[in-house]
Amino acid sequence: ELDTPKDLQVSETAETSLTLLWKTPLAKFDRYRLNYSLPTGQWVGVQLPRNTTSYVLRGLEPGQEYNVLLTAEKGRHKSKPARVKASTEEVPSLENLTVTEAGWDGLRLNWTADDLAYEYFVIQVQEANNVETAHNFTVPGNLRAADIPGLKVATSYRVSIYGVARGYRTPVLSAETSTGTTPNLGEVTVAEVGWDALTLNWTAPEGAYKNFFIQVLEADTTQTVQNLTVPGGLRSVDLPGLKAATRYYITLRGVTQDFGTAPLSVEVLTEDLPQLGGLSVTEVSWDGLTLNWTTDDLAYKHFVVQVQEANNVEAAQNLTVPGSLRAVDIPGLKADTPYRVSIYGVIQGYRTPMLSTDVSTAREPEIGNLNVSDVTPKSFNLSWTATDGIFDMFTIEIIDSNRLLQTAEHNISGAERTAHISGLPPSTDFIVYLSGIAPSIRTKTISTTATTEALPLLENLTISDTNPYGFTVSWTASENAFDSFLVTVVDSGKLLDPQEFTLSGTQRKLELRGLITGIGYEVLVSGFTQGHQTKPLRAETITAMGSPKEVIFSDITENSATVSWRAPTAQVESFRITYVPITGGTPSMVTVDGTKTQTRLVKLIPGVEYLVSIIAMKGFEESEPVSGSFTTA
């Protein structure tokens, strides 16, 4: 029996052909018969020599399926057929050709094509009214769009395209369109004018120009200083390398392949060279300062600040600060020291002229003049002086001298110069310590002493105007401290009932009358506050004759003078006046009626100083004397 041909397969497919391959069978045979079906259902047969191992079916229809049978024959014997099924390739096709205006001197083509491996596309462009002007372009097979530049302005064109895939050429697609009108340059402006550069901006239609030509002239010399060509896609360009404070004339042209626009021009003045200005020192403290400066609004790379002691140029420190700053704090300086502070800026490799200023740091913060005022039994006020604007806080320590109380510490705002210290015990000695605290310093401590007042006491009980029938009691007391006073009067022998007098809290004295002459009395005064009684003050006296008062001399001559006095409150029988020269001698005496308050002294020696004493008398009682002196003419 004959072998079937081996490994029948389709090795290549094309739109109109299929390539078959197979292997020779082992058994001997004379020939092959190849049969394949047509789309119509018919079979076509081909006889092939025995040494054939491949065959190309040609003239097939694209995109159709074919059945292939291959048998080996020997005489009338046939092998079983080898079978294979295969389809021819689809015919490549182009569709949807669209042409859009690509600016005023070009067109843009878009098309669709099936996903075949196109080798290339052929595009033909010709003026609709001039067939001789045809241009052919070949573009790669992977593209589905193409720009056709270099056309005439406002011209009708016929555009055709076909594709080539595996040697097969698609049908041609065609379209008609027109290019746009000539573009115009818009406006040209200058932005970001610096001292050595500027930025040129302009407007123009998109895709209109191949490039732009820019010419820069110095306006005063008309000398061209720069020519440059930039791509047509740009709308802005930086022009560096200019001179400071110079007027420039700049022109701009748009350029196409065969066309240049009319130039647009602009005139501009570059800025002055950058320089620093307004160097000032603010917030000078004792250990630092703040430096401020002004500059033109340029992008400085950095500033270099140099600080040196005015009297010690070797002690210089340099500080580089970012170009965005216009102020810098310079710490770590010496107090009360003159400094020279300098600064320059660095911008695009250019170093501005240096600015300098002289400044002295403040004296080291000080506190002083710690004073105590407004002392009460439980509080006092403190005041002090201090360097302004330095201290964050003051610390006040209050320690009682006997160290019996817990130390009180008060922290007070650095803006304050006074403090009210309260809640203290009365009649207590205190030591007050004050120190100031600033960010980097605590001052030496200063101190003072303070003593709280005693509680409101009754004080200074005195007895005055003693006379035979009474006396005046007076005392001192704190204002508004007492609701009432109790005055108790007891005779020393405790023979009589005590007399009690209740007085208002505003009174400070009591005149006692109707007492017995010549006996001792004890007086007790105590105060009441909200029902609380003070311990009493005590005083003792004896009722007696009141003394005359206020001796006055008048009408003095060589040998006489008048003496006057004020009589005591109680009635007396008489006054005895004794007078004698101060240098010595026999005293002279005059007695006058108790109703009189003056008498004439006679038979005196000229130019002599006399000592005069006056006593009041009643029965056998004599008052204490009152004295005075005068000198005759």
């Epitope: 039994p377 439980k378 009649s427 005693a454 509680l455 506050t529 909200q530 029902g531 009684q533 311990k535």
Partner: antibody
Framework: EVQLLESGGGLVQPGGSLRLSCAAS????????MSWVRQAPGKGLEWVSA????????YYADSVKGRFTISKDNSKNTLYLQMNSLRAEDTAVYYC???????????WGQGTLVTVSS | SSELTQDPAVSVALGQTVRVTCQGD??????ASWYQQKPGQAPVLVIY???NRPSGIPDRFSGSSSGNTASLTITGAQAEDEADYYC??????????FGGGTKLTVL
């Protein structure tokens, strides 16, 4: 017979307010100064505030100054204590007491309990 | 801290004499007042001024003063005298001041 009767105590939250009253009888109310004294549980007596007979002068302990207000209505023979911004440490029995010109705190009421708690 | 200082506790045998003391700067100027307080009751004034007793207070209670110290003396203490005793005075700002109290135990 002198009688003093406090009222108005109770439970209040911290920061709250309370008004205590003390009804007086048996004496000429307008002639005498009055005081409030408090006693925290298990603690000693603490004077709180005082007012003169006419009501013209008032006195306060530092611990309540600015928060408590003492007043008296002589026409109603009543003493008041307005307590604002109450704190836990204000918890106590509050007594009202009478003061004579020469005798301190001679008569006391039986007290009213104020509890400040959340 | 209180402006008047008292001993926290004192004890006395029945019938014996006991002295309760109070110290403070205000006592240099003012006489102390003394109050007795029994559990659950309001305080009662027992001594005021130099040595004054309100009516109804037994004469076994007496007061004295020296310097910055005031004393309350109970001569012949009775069981019913067991109580807390508070001294009281007035300070410079017319504020009443109380001592911390003394617990008296009668044995």
């Amino acid at each position: 017979e002198v009688q003093l009767l406090e009222s108005g105590g109770g439970l209040v939250q911290p920061g709250g307010s309370l008004r205590l009253s003390c009804a007086a009888s048996g004496f000429t109310f307008s002639s005498y100064a009055m005081s409030w004294v408090r006693q925290a549980p298990g603690k000693g007596l603490e004077w709180v505030s005082a007012i003169s007979g006419s009501g013209g002068s008032t006195y306060y302990a530092d611990s309540v100054k600015g928060r408590f207000t003492i007043s008296k209505d002589n026409s109603k023979n009543t003493l008041y204590l307005q307590m604002n911004s109450l704190r836990a440490e204000d918890t106590a029995v509050y007594y009202c007491a009478k003061t004579s010109p020469r005798v301190p705190l001679d008569y006391w009421g039986q007290g009213t309990l104020v509890t400040v708690s959340s | 801290s209180s402006e008047l200082t008292q001993d926290p506790a004192v004890s006395v045998a029945l019938g014996q004499t006991v002295r309760v003391t109070c110290q403070g700067d205000s006592l240099r100027s003012y006489y102390a007042s003394w109050y007795q307080q029994k559990p659950g009751q309001a305080p009662v004034l027992v001594i005021y001024g130099k040595n004054n007793r309100p009516s109804g207070i037994p004469d076994r209670f007496s007061g004295s003063s020296s310097g910055n110290t005031a004393s309350l003396t109970i001569t012949g203490a009775q069981a019913e005298d067991e109580a807390d005793y508070y001294c009281n005075s007035i300070n410079s700002t017319r504020n009443e001041v109380f001592g911390g109290g003394t617990k008296l135990t009668v044995l």
